[in-house]
């Protein structure tokens, strides 16, 4: 009985032509949506003139359908039992699932001003930047449409810089017609306990963003895990969105459309400072903003973003230290809404439902040379938006799963 089921499962979760796993892996059968909430700044002038707390009001959801494109360049390597692929990016706006349109306007931090003043440190360059910021009538904050903010716009200040700088900015620019990878993952043919585990990403086993073990590419991409998942396991996975590997731990048993699944969550410990979780020492990349590595709940991913001062956190600075959220008014973190979870069917290791939540923030610092940042008296990690990417197994697929997998076990 059980042995036969195990044998069948082992056969069907291998990532090769003809298996159930492969069919769903190449092109997910689940509809995946990415909801965005934008933090609309209510008091831009007071912040710029008096270094006041930033008052934000979230507006959303603005929903896009994502991950609808099949993996590309899928290539099996029989020699090392791996399969490599590219994951194409695409996003389609869903008006019926959104509070407004892509043309809605938001007052947000000026991405170009914050990034350029951070990266271009030379004194004379800063003088040039200051004159061009003024000439282009740019400021510390700007009004942008949702479409511009997410997918890119030509910045008026950067367009005047007399060097070959990047003039188009956007939080996810470029996105459409790009692809993530190349990923090379184990197909499980020789060893089912390695199935879907990433061997290399962009041709390397390390990221080159972090020191020591923090730089490792661990586990799968979280879409599936090797079969026969135990509650005691720590599930490692890599997320290119946050430029690091992270992990989830068992939280509870959940019934999903009649299928028993294990809910795994990202624990607060994963976001802790090295003071509380020494393993995290290598995610602390500088001493000033992190207050000597005592701040927690924000991850400086600038090295992964060409030096732009991007910080990733959980929405509303959930699990972050008070000093991070202190300069921002209007945030209300709560676990239920803002944490990330994966609902995993333990026999197959498939993720049947998930909610990936993260927040994109940008650091802005006072600058003596740049007039629009001159009055700032402190550093701000400014929330720009947070997102909730969700997917749930469809009813039809759930029926198939119940009859072919869980039904047979019970």
């Amino acid at each position: 009985g059980d042995l036969l089921i195990q044998k069948t499962i082992k056969k069907q979760v291998v990532l090769e032509e003809g298996t159930i796993a492969f069919k769903n892996w190449v092109k997910t059968g689940t509809e995946v949506y990415r909801q965005f909430w934008i933090f609309d700044v209510q008091n831009p002038q007071e912040v710029m003139m008096n270094s006041s707390n930033i008052q934000v009001k979230q507006r959303g959801p603005y929903t896009y359908r994502v991950r609808f494109l099949a993996k590309e360049n899928v290539t099996q390597d029989a020699e090392d039992n791996t399969v490599s692929f590219l994951q194409p990016n695409g996003a389609i706006f869903e008006p019926s699932l959104s509070v407004g349109t892509e043309a809605d306007n938001f007052t947000v931090l000026n991405l170009a001003v914050a990034a350029a003043s951070h990266i271009y440190q030379n004194q004379f360059v800063q003088m040039i930047l200051n004159s061009l910021i003024n000439k282009s009538k740019s400021s510390m904050f700007q009004v942008r449409t949702l479409r511009e903010l997410l997918w890119g716009y030509r910045d008026p200040f950067l367009s005047l810089v007399p060097y070959p700088v990047t003039t188009t900015v956007g939080l996810f620019y470029p996105y459409n017609n790009t692809a993530d990878g190349v990923y090379k993952v184990f197909n499980g043919k020789d060893n089912i306990s390695k199935v879907a585990i990433i061997d290399t990403y962009k041709g390397k086993r390390n990221l080159s963003y972090w020191e020591s073990h923090c730089d490792m590419i661990n586990g799968t991409d979280a879409a599936s895990f090797p079969p026969f998942v135990e509650k005691s396991q720590v599930l490692q996975f890599f997320s290119s969105d946050i430029c690091r590997s992270i992990y989830a731990v068992f939280e509870s048993d959940v019934n999903l459309k009649g299928i028993p699944v294990y809910r795994f969550v990202l624990p607060s410990k994963a976001f802790a400072s090295p003071v509380e979780n020494p393993d995290n020492y290598c995610f602390c990349t500088e001493k000033i903003i992190s207050k000597n590595c005592t701040s927690y709940g924000v991850l400086d991913i600038s090295k992964c973003k060409e030096g732009r001062p991007v910080y990733i956190s959980l929405p509303h600075f959930l699990y972050a230290s008070p000093d991070v959220s202190e300069p921002i008014d209007g945030l209300n973190p709560n676990e239920e809404e803002h944490r990330t979870y994966l609902d995993i069917e333990p026999i197959t290791g498939f993720t049947l439902q998930f909610a990936k939540r993260l927040q994109v923030n940008l650091l802005v610092k006072p600058s003596e040379k740049i007039q629009v940042l001159k009055n700032l008296k402190r550093n701000y990690i400014v929330p720009i938006l947070w997102l909730n990417e969700t997917g749930t197994i469809g009813d039809e697929k759930a029926n198939m799963f119940r009859s072919q997998v869980t039904g047979k076990i019970n």
Epitope: A115, I119, Y120, Q121, N122, F124, V125, I128, V161, P162, Y163, P164, V165, T166, E306, G307, R308
Partner: nanobody, 124 residues
Framework: QVQLQESGGGLVQPGGSLRLSCAAS????????????MSWYRQAPGKERELVAA????????HYADSVKGRFTISRDNAKNTVYLLMNSLKPEDTAAYYC?????????????WGQGTQVTVSS
Amino acid sequence: QVQLQESGGGLVQPGGSLRLSCAASGFTSGFTFSSYAMSWYRQAPGKERELVAAITNAGDSTHYADSVKGRFTISRDNAKNTVYLLMNSLKPEDTAAYYCNAVTLQGWSEYDYWGQGTQVTVSS
């Protein structure tokens, strides 16, 4: 890797003149001398390094510290990969080590290079 070599420093009496030169070499991967904004900085003992004069990559715009305006002139010769600082009406407070700087931007990167410096002493 860009190398910058300053020359022309020395001992000069108050009211005198000097012309500093900075020769640039080692340009690679699509960058030429005319890709760089060039600057002169100075640092007196126990003081912070200060920007004295600068010229844009195209040579169409210059900047001077208030303390040297009307006395110092920065210029560049892109054919010779050299930037100059002509210093007139020198004062004892101009005594410092003078450093040449080259900077350019590409994408989201800043490429910033420094020379070893040349000493200028204004004394009677």
